[in-house]
Interface confidence: low
């Protein structure tokens, strides 16, 4: 426990102290006091440097004194023979004696008292930065106006820390600038910009005057910049010694201004700004950048647009452009996105045609569609060549993205009809000579295939059976052969509106407009035995002249049989209508004058007994196309006749082309390609 005073006596005092003794006393007075130690008696064996016996006074690590020998007071009014004054509150006294004493020595008597110390003046190191105030047992520090006492209760400073600057540009100055800055202060300023900007400090030479360095080159007052692990400074002196611009490469900067107690100058003023991080102008193939600039910096946004034929693929979605932003780290966003060649994908297949598997389906690749020749041709032109276009579609120069249509070639038999041995007014024929020939089994009749979905026949064939069964592709109509041929299923029968329906068809005398169309449920596949006949053109080239030859075919009555099992055909000439009028009607059901002859009818035959007959109805009267000798068109349809083996009457198809086209158009269903 600290005490205010005390006594210290050598062992056995006032008797002689013993040999070989070492004893110590720890003196402690209260905090804030010093110690006055004084000796009133001193009788210790004398030796050089008090080596034998001694009393030692120690303050901390410092020896305040070492005593031996005899002392007496110089002052008759004071008993004090030796004294010590220490400004500390602790002191140690150590007494030592060696193994022998030549004489008898009585030792020492000493006293200590606590004394007030003046902390403001008694120490080399001044305890207060500004004003020091002593009191008994302690002191306190105080500050001049506008200064405040720091937490250490010793140092005064100005309130110049804690400012945080976040604006992209700004100005910072030392306190009171350009008046002298405060002494003994530490000012800290923080600049915190958003990521993507580096702090650039600009300090003009003339805006800087800070107490110069000492002889060793150490700044007494200093300005330091700290950016992450990089430090700029310390700077001091008259005129800024650093660079005009300090590029910190960081968005965070700490500015530390430290001053000592002496030598105040005007200080400093600086400007800073946020310099956006640059992003490199990258070479992105197959694209253009907008806007185009020499330099891109943080927050710049560019639109990267792919060149024609290239696209950005992200997941499953294709786009032609994307935005990229210069980011805070100096890298572009969306940098993984690239302009890749557009992929048009596997081309769609087409009915009755094919496309070779392409080597590549990327932009610029070329494919070729072909139709199944010689039975189909490309209706809508364009040559069948498509290239992979920039929009990801296969495109043809003529058709654009529209696919080619393979439509049946009409009027071209695989084998031409040649009249062989004569068979009662006609010859045996093969279905390949007349691949358009359609067989109706009820009533036994014929028809002509004009495209994939439509059969042309005579109205009187279908008026009594609106769901006829039809066959194509067979020369023979024996039941066993028909089973192997292609059966056609009707969807709807369209009889010409000008055909007069009768309650008793057997008594018919008016065969005007004897024409009908049968729409098929499914398209017919063309080949060597199944192929359509052409329709006549509407020009005068297709007006028949007397003597023009045409071919008829069918399984109708011959001179030997009511019905033919194998296909028969004949070549016969067009005749004037009067020739047909002049023939006496066989088994008339009415007066000869009642039979109607109209311009919608063609009269043909009369040569060598060649004629169509019962069972041939609806079959085509095929005439060579005047504009393309390789093709046949349906000039007529077997309609009626006054007498088999003479002249026959055929519906003049040319007069019905408009009706045929209109009916087909209005009743076509979109193809499911």
């Amino acid at each position: 426990e600290p005490t205010m005073y005390g006594e210290i006596l050598s062992p056995n005092y006032p008797q002689a102290y013993p040999s070989e003794v070492e004893k110590s006393w720890d003196i402690e007075v209260p905090e804030g006091y010093g110690i006055h130690l004084y000796f009133t008696h001193l009788d210790i064996e004398l030796s050089e440097n008090c080596a034998y016996d001694s009393v030692q006074i120690i303050s901390g690590d410092t020896e305040e004194g070492r005593l031996c020998g005899q002392r007496s007071s110089n002052n008759p009014h004071s008993p004090i023979v030796e004294e010590f004054q220490v400004p500390y509150n602790k002191l140690q006294v150590i007494f030592k004696s060696d193994f022998s004493n030549e004489e008898r020595f009585t030792g020492f008597a000493a006293y200590y008292v606590a004394t007030d110390i003046n902390e403001c003046t008694d120490f080399v190191d001044v305890p207060c930065s500004h004003f020091c105030n002593n009191f008994i047992g302690g002191y306190f520090c105080s500050c001049p106006p506008e200064y405040f006492l720091h937490d250490d209760m010793k140092n005064c400073g100005v309130n110049c820390s804690g400012d945080v600057f976040t604006a992209l540009i700004g100005e910072i100055a030392s306190p009171n600038y350009p008046k002298p800055y405060p002494e003994n202060s530490r000012c800290e300023y923080q600049i915190r910009l958003e990521k993507g900007f580096q702090v650039v400090v600009t300090l003009r030479r003339e805006d800087f005057d800070v107490e110069a360095a000492d002889s060793a080159g150490n700044c007494l007052d200093s300005l330091v910049f700290v950016a992450g692990d990089r430090q700029f400074g310390p700077y001091c002196g008259h005129g800024f010694p650093g660079p005009l611009n300090i590029e910190t490469k960081s968005n965070a900067l700490d500015i530390i201004f430290q001053t000592d107690l002496t030598g105040q100058k005007k200080g400093w003023k600086l400007r800073y700004h946020g310099d956006p991080m640059p992003c490199p102008k990258e070479d992105t193939p197959n694209s253009v950048w907008e806007p185009a600039k020499a330099k891109y910096v943080f927050r710049d946004v560019v639109q990267i647009t792919c060149l024609d034929g290239f696209e950005v693929v992200e997941g499953r979605v294709g786009a032609t452009s994307f935005y990229s932003t210069c980011q805070s780290n100096g890298k572009w966003s969306n940098s993984k996105l690239k302009c890749q060649p557009v992929d048009c994908g596997i081309p769609e297949s087409i009915e009755n045609g094919k496309v070779e598997d392409p080597e590549s389906t990327l932009f610029g690749s070329v494919i070729r569609y072909t139709c199944e020749e010689p039975y189909y041709y490309m209706e809508n032109g364009g040559g069948g060549e498509y290239h992979c276009a920039g929009n990801g579609s296969w495109v043809n120069e003529v058709l654009g993205p529209e696919l080619p249509k393979c439509v049946p070639v009409c009027g071209v038999p695989r084998e031409p009809f040649e009249e062989k041995q004569r068979i009662i007014g006609g010859s045996d024929a093969d279905i390949k000579n007349f691949p358009w020939q359609v067989f109706f089994d009820n009533p036994w009749a014929g028809g002509a295939l004009i495209n994939e979905y439509w059969v042309l026949t005579a109205a009187h064939v279908v008026e009594g059976n609106r769901e006829p069964t039809m066959y194509v592709g067979s020369t023979s109509v024996q039941t066993s052969r028909l089973a192997k041929s292609k059966m056609l299923t009707p969807e709807h029968v369209f009889i010409h509106p000008g055909w007069k329906l009768l309650e008793v068809p057997e008594g018919r005398t008016n065969f005007d407009n004897d024409i009908a169309l049968v729409r098929l449920k499914d398209p017919v596949k063309m080949g060597p035995t199944v192929s359509p006949i052409c329709l006549p053109g509407t020009s005068s080239d297709y007006n028949l002249m007397d003597g023009d030859l045409g071919l008829i075919s069918g399984w109708g009555r011959t001179e030997k049989r009511d019905r033919a099992v194998r296909l028969k055909a004949a070549r016969l000439p067009v005749a004037p209508l009067r020739k047909c009028k002049e023939v006496k009607v066989e088994k008339p059901t009415a007066d000869a004058e009642a039979y109607v002859f109209t311009p919608n009818m063609i009269c043909a035959g009369g040569e060598k007994g060649m004629d169509s007959c019962k069972g041939d109805s609806g079959g085509a009267f095929a005439v060579q196309d005047p504009n393309d000798k390789t093709k046949f068109y349906a000039a007529g349809l077997v309609s009626w006749g006054p007498q088999c083996g003479t002249y026959g009457l055929y519906t003049r198809v040319k007069n019905y082309v408009d009706w045929i086209m209109k009916t087909m158009q209005e009743n076509s269903t979109p193809r499911e390609d």
């Epitope: 992209l168 540009i169 956006p276 330099k295 935005y323």
Partner: antibody, heavy 119, light 105 residues
Framework: EVQLQQSGPELVKPGASVKISCKAS????????IHWVKQSPEKSLEWIGE????????TYNQKFKAKATLTVDKSSNTAYMQLKSLTSEDSAVYYC????????????WGQGTLVTVSA | DIVLTQTTAIMSASPGEKVTMTCSAS?????MYWFQQKPGTSPKRWIY???KLASGVPARFSGSGSGTSYSLTISTMEAEDAATYYC????????FGGGTKLEIN
């Protein structure tokens, strides 16, 4: 609210120079380019150039390279355009405009400054 | 520089009528931009990226086109649409069209 406030009309003599200003407010001035556009009855709208207020980098339309000088004063958030060697063909309304981070330039416009060159 | 041509300098339309104005570029560009300007005021950004409407632009406006041919369409004309419309490109150094003044009958 983003605002670009331009200086008032100017009547200047042929051969002289003029400096017009565009004070920005309501946004971080150094964050966006400032463009200048000329509008005259004869030539409709013409882009003069742009300046990056942070770096002071400029890009000019070739036609105006010898005519216009673009500068900024970051401390006052103000952009300037100086036009020199003025002739009657320079009589026009001049606009400053700010771009945006995204798909378009000229997102915000000043109210325009009418410059009349007349003896 | 890319030259933008607005062939119709002045056109008029009645309220409710459909209006289409065109702008052709001297060479192919990626996107077209349109501005609207009324007398005594600054131009306003109207359509960007060829077909996107700037904020506040009525849905009756639309933009379309590609390559060198672009157009701005108003599906049903209203009195407030009377103004001058400028086309603008920035595929190279920015340029503007001469403007089409749309008047109301």
């Amino acid at each position: 609210e983003v605002q670009l406030q331009q200086s008032g009309p100017e009547l200047v003599k042929p051969g002289a120079s003029v400096k017009i200003s565009c004070k920005a407010s309501g946004y971080s001035f150094t964050g966006y380019y400032i463009h200048w556009v000329k509008q005259s009855p004869e030539k409709s709208l013409e882009w003069i150039g742009e300046i990056n207020p942070t770096t002071n980098d400029t890009t000019y339309n070739q036609k105006f390279k010898a005519k216009a000088t673009l500068t900024v004063d970051k401390s006052s958030n103000t952009a300037y355009m100086q036009l020199k060697s003025l002739t009657s063909e320079d009589s026009a309304v001049y606009y400053c405009s700010r771009d945006i981070s995204g798909p378009a330039w000229f997102a915000y416009w000043g109210q325009g400054t009418l410059v009349t060159v007349s003896a | 520089d890319i030259v933008l041509t607005q062939t119709t300098a002045i056109m008029s339309a009645s309220p409710g009528e459909k209006v289409t104005m065109t702008c052709s570029a001297s060479s192919s560009i990626s996107y077209m931009y349109w501005f609207q300007q009324k007398p005594g005021t600054s131009p306003k950004r109207w359509i960007y990226d060829t077909s996107k409407l700037a904020s506040g632009v009525p849905a009756r406006f639309s933009g379309s086109g590609s390559g060198t041919s672009y157009s701005l369409t108003i599906s049903t004309m209203e009195a407030e649409d009377a103004a001058t419309y400028y086309c603008h490109q920035r595929s190279s150094d920015p340029t503007f069209g001469g403007g089409t003044k749309l008047e109301i009958n």
